[in-house]
Interface confidence: medium
C-alpha cells in the first residue's frame, strides 16, 4: 500500500516569540527516502527542515528520528516571528538521483499572533471652533491575525466611524488598521476626550486605547464686555474689560485711548471655569480731571493668534456737564458714538426747560401766598456713594442720565438751620442701595441753595443710610 503522510492540525496559532510544534506522521518508512518540511507550495516553496542535511537553527525534531521504525516526523519551531506565518507541508521523498516527491501531508497553517501597536489618534492641524466638524484618525499596526475590532467614543458615547480599513486586504504576516471619525465640536468640549479602542485576540479582552484630548483641537473665542464701575473718588472712572469663557489661555489685552495704545496686558492670573475655559478681567483707571473732551476707550483682545476683538467705551468730558460735574461714560461697541448719547442729551435739555418753568411757576405761587407750606420730595440714589454723585449710569441702561456732583465734604457737617415756620422747605432724600429703573431719566437743576445735613429723627426709621438735601426757599 502507498505511504500516507498525516498532518493532524489544519492550523495552529502561536504567539510571536513562542515555540510551536508541527505534527507529521507516516504510515510506512517505505520506500526509503527522507522527509522534508516546506513552507508554501510550488516553485517558490521554502525548505524549512531536512532531517539529514542543512542547518536549521530554530527547527528541530520532536522525536528521535534515528530510532528504527520511528514514524513521527513532527518538528518544533522556536522563537516564532510573524515572518514564520504560512502553510507548512510535511513531504515524503523517495531516495534517488535526484530524490523524488511521492506524498505530501495536507498542510498545517501557522498563524503567528502579534499584538496591535497602541492606537495613535491624530486630529486636525488647526484648532476648530464650536459647531465645526473635525475628523480624527486612529491607526494601529503590526497585529495578526487580521480579525480586529475598533470602536470610537466621545465622553463615553460610542461614535460611528466614517470609514475603517484593515490593510493589506490579502494574506499577510501582519496587518494595519486605520479608522476615521467625524466629531462636531461644542463649546463645552475643552475637557472632552475622543477615544479609539482596539480589541484583538492577543489582548485578552483588555482593549488598547488611544486618546485625543479635545483641548488640543478646539478654540473657544472669548466674549468681551467693557463695563464701568462706580467711581472710587471724585476724579476717577473705573473701566473693566472682561474676556469670558475662552480656550486656550493665549490672550493679549490692549487698552487704547482714542485709538492710541495706552496699556498692554499680558494676563497671568486667569481664572479657570469648570468646563475648562478661562476668564480674565482687566481694570483700567481713567483720570477724569485729565479729560475735558469725549474719550473713546477701546479694549482690544487678541486670542490665540486670531483677529482682535474690540469693544469701545465712550467717556464724555467736562464740557458736557456742570463745572463741578464728574465724567460721564457710555458703552460703545461700534466705532461711532452711540445714538443714545444724542437722545439722552436731548431729553436732558427738554427736562431742564420743564424744570426751569416749574421753578418759575413755584416762585410766582410763593409770592402770591401769605403763609408758607412744607412739602417733601424724595430722589433715589442708585449706587454706593451718595456723597459724591447723585446718579451713576448703569452701562446697560438705554437712557441717558445727566447728573450733577454734590461734592460734599465727609467731615463735620454744618448744623442745619432751623426752618422758619412760614418757610417752604423741600427735602431730597438720597438713599443708598436703591437702583433706579432704567427708564427713569433724571435731570438736576442748579443746586446753589442746597445744604446737606444728617436726617432729623423721623417718624419711621430709614431703610438705609440717608442724607437729606434741605432746600431753603425764602418767601418774598
Amino acid at each position: 500500500t502507498e505511504v500516507k503522510v498525516t498532518q493532524p492540525e489544519k492550523s495552529v496559532s502561536v504567539a510571536a516569540g513562542d515555540s510551536t510544534i508541527l505534527n507529521c506522521t507516516v504510515t510506512s518508512l517505505l520506500p526509503v527516502g527522507p522527509i522534508r518540511w516546506y513552507r508554501g507550495v510550488g516553485q517558490s516553496r521554502l525548505l524549512i527542515y531536512n532531517q539529514k542535511e542543512g542547518h536549521f537553527p530554530r527547527v528541530r525534531n520532536v522525536s528521535d528520528t534515528t530510532k528504527r521504525n520511528n514514524m513521527d516526523f513532527s518538528i518544533r519551531i522556536s522563537n516564532v516571528t510573524p515572518e514564520d506565518a504560512g502553510t507548512y507541508y510535511c513531504v515524503k521523498f523517495q531516495k534517488g538521483s535526484p530524490d523524488t516527491e511521492i506524498q505530501s501531508g495536507g498542510g498545517t497553517e501557522v498563524y503567528v499572533l502579534a499584538k496591535p501597536s497602541p492606537p495613535e489618534v491624530s486630529g486636525p492641524a488647526d484648532r476648530g471652533i464650536p459647531d465645526q466638524k473635525v475628523n480624527f484618525t486612529c491607526k494601529s499596526h503590526g497585529f495578526s491575525p487580521r480579525n480586529i475590532t475598533l470602536k470610537w467614543f466621545k465622553d463615553g458615547q460610542e461614535l460611528h466611524p466614517l470609514e475603517t480599513t484593515v490593510n493589506p486586504s490579502g494574506k499577510n504576516v501582519s496587518y494595519n488598521i486605520s479608522s476615521t471619525v467625524r466629531v462636531v465640536l461644542n463649546s463645552m468640549d475643552v475637557n472632552s476626550k475622543v477615544i479609539c479602542e482596539v480589541a484583538h485576540i492577543t489582548l485578552d479582552r483588555s482593549p488598547l486605547r488611544g486618546i485625543a484630548n479635545l483641548s488640543n483641537f478646539i478654540r473657544v473665542s472669548p466674549t468681551v464686555k467693557v463695563t464701568q464701575q462706580s467711581p472710587t473718588s471724585m476724579n476717577q472712572v473705573n473701566l473693566t474689560c472682561r474676556a469670558e469663557r475662552f480656550y486656550p489661555e493665549d490672550l493679549q489685552l490692549i487698552w487704547l485711548e482714542n485709538g492710541n495704545v495706552s496699556r498692554n496686558d499680558t494676563p497671568k492670573n486667569l481664572t479657570k471655569n469648570t468646563d475648562g475655559t478661562y476668564n480674565y478681567t482687566s481694570l483700567f483707571l481713567v483720570n477724569s480731571s485729565a479729560h475735558r473732551e469725549d474719550v473713546v476707550f477701546t479694549c482690544q483682545v487678541k486670542h490665540d493668534q486670531q483677529p482682535a476683538i474690540t469693544r469701545n467705551h465712550t467717556v464724555l468730558g467736562f464740557a458736557h456737564s456742570s463745572d463741578q460735574g464728574s465724567m460721564q461714560t457710555f458703552p460703545d461697541n461700534n466705532a461711532t458714538h452711540n445714538w443714545n448719547v444724542f437722545i439722552g442729551v436731548g431729553v436732558a435739555c427738554a427736562l431742564l426747560v420743564v424744570l426751569l418753568m416749574a421753578a418759575l411757576y413755584l416762585l410766582r405761587i410763593k409770592q402770591k401766598k401769605a403763609k408758607g407750606s412744607t412739602s417733601s420730595t424724595r430722589l433715589h440714589e442708585p449706587e454706593k456713594n451718595a456723597r459724591e454723585i447723585t446718579q451713576i449710569q448703569d452701562t446697560n441702561d438705554i437712557n441717558d442720565i445727566t447728573y450733577a456732583d454734590l461734592n460734599l465734604p465727609k467731615e463735620k457737617k454744618p448744623a442745619p438751620r432751623a426752618p422758619e415756620p412760614n418757610n417752604h422747605t423741600e427735602y431730597a432724600s438720597i438713599e443708598t442701595g436703591k437702583v433706579p429703573r432704567p427708564e427713569d431719566t433724571l435731570t438736576y437743576a442748579d443746586l446753589d441753595m442746597v445744604h446737606l445735613s444728617r436726617a432729623q429723627p423721623a417718624p419711621k426709621p430709614e431703610p438705609s443710610f440717608s442724607e437729606y438735601a434741605s432746600v431753603q426757599v425764602q418767601r418774598k
Epitope: 493532524p8 492540525e9 489544519k10 492550523s11 495552529v12 496559532s13 502561536v14 504567539a15 510571536a16 516569540g17 513562542d18 515555540s19 510551536t20 510544534i21 518544533r76 522556536s78 499572533l113 499584538k115 485576540i201 492577543t202 485578552d204 479582552r205
Partner: antibody
Framework: EVQLVESGGGVVQPGRSLRLSCAAS????????MIWVRQAPGKGLEWVAS????????YYADSVKGRFTISRDNSKNTLYLQMNSLRAEDTAVYYC?????????????WGQGTMVTVSS | DTQLTQSPSSLSASVGQRVTITCGAS??????MHWYQQKPGKQPKLLIY???NLEAGVPSRFSGSGSGTDFTLTISSLQPEDFATYYC?????????FGQGTKLEIK
Amino acid sequence: EVQLVESGGGVVQPGRSLRLSCAASGFTFSDYGMIWVRQAPGKGLEWVASISSSSSYIYYADSVKGRFTISRDNSKNTLYLQMNSLRAEDTAVYYCARRYYGFNYPFDYWGQGTMVTVSS
Amino acid sequence: DTQLTQSPSSLSASVGQRVTITCGASKSVRTYMHWYQQKPGKQPKLLIYSASNLEAGVPSRFSGSGSGTDFTLTISSLQPEDFATYYCQQSNEPPYTFGQGTKLEIK
C-alpha cells in the same frame, strides 16, 4: 518524565491573599505555555488563566480578572498564581498544566493539584 | 465566550458496550476541541486532541470526530478502567472553556 507539582494551597479567610506555585521538571519549561485550571468540590473543570512561554501573552477568566495574577520564572522552572481578594467561590483544587505548543493545542500534562479553601 | 454543552450529563453502561458522548459549542471552534478523562481524586488526562487525534499512550478504542460546533467522543468497547468523568474543552479562543462533564458509570 514530565512532572508538575503544585504547592501553596491551604485555608484562608475571605479577602485575604494566597500564592500558588507549580514546579516543573522533565521538559524545557521555557518552551511551553502554562495554565491554571480549578475544580470546585463536586463540580467541573474551570480554566483560570494561561501564560505563553515568553510571558508576552496572558489571559484570565472573567471570574478572576483583576484579582488573580499568573506569572512564571523560566530560570526557576516555576509557574505562579497570585490570588488576591479571595472569595468563598474560589474554594477549589487548583491544577497547573502544560499547554502543548501553540495557542490552539490542548493541556497535555497536569499536576496533582493543590486545595485552596476560602472560609471565615 | 464559547459555551460548551455536553450530553448526556451522566451515563450508565456495561463493559464491552459502545458509548458516545457529544459536545456542542455555542459558536464554531474549528477543530480545536479536546477530550479529557478524570477519575475521582485524580488530575485530568488528555485523550483526544484537535477533535480526532489520539494522544500518545491512549488506547485505540477511544476516538473523536467533528468540527465547527458538533463533536463526538466514542469508546468502541468499554473497559472497567474507562468508568470516569469525561470533559470536552475548546482552545479556539480564550477563555478556554470546558464542558460541564459526562459521568460514565457501570451499569
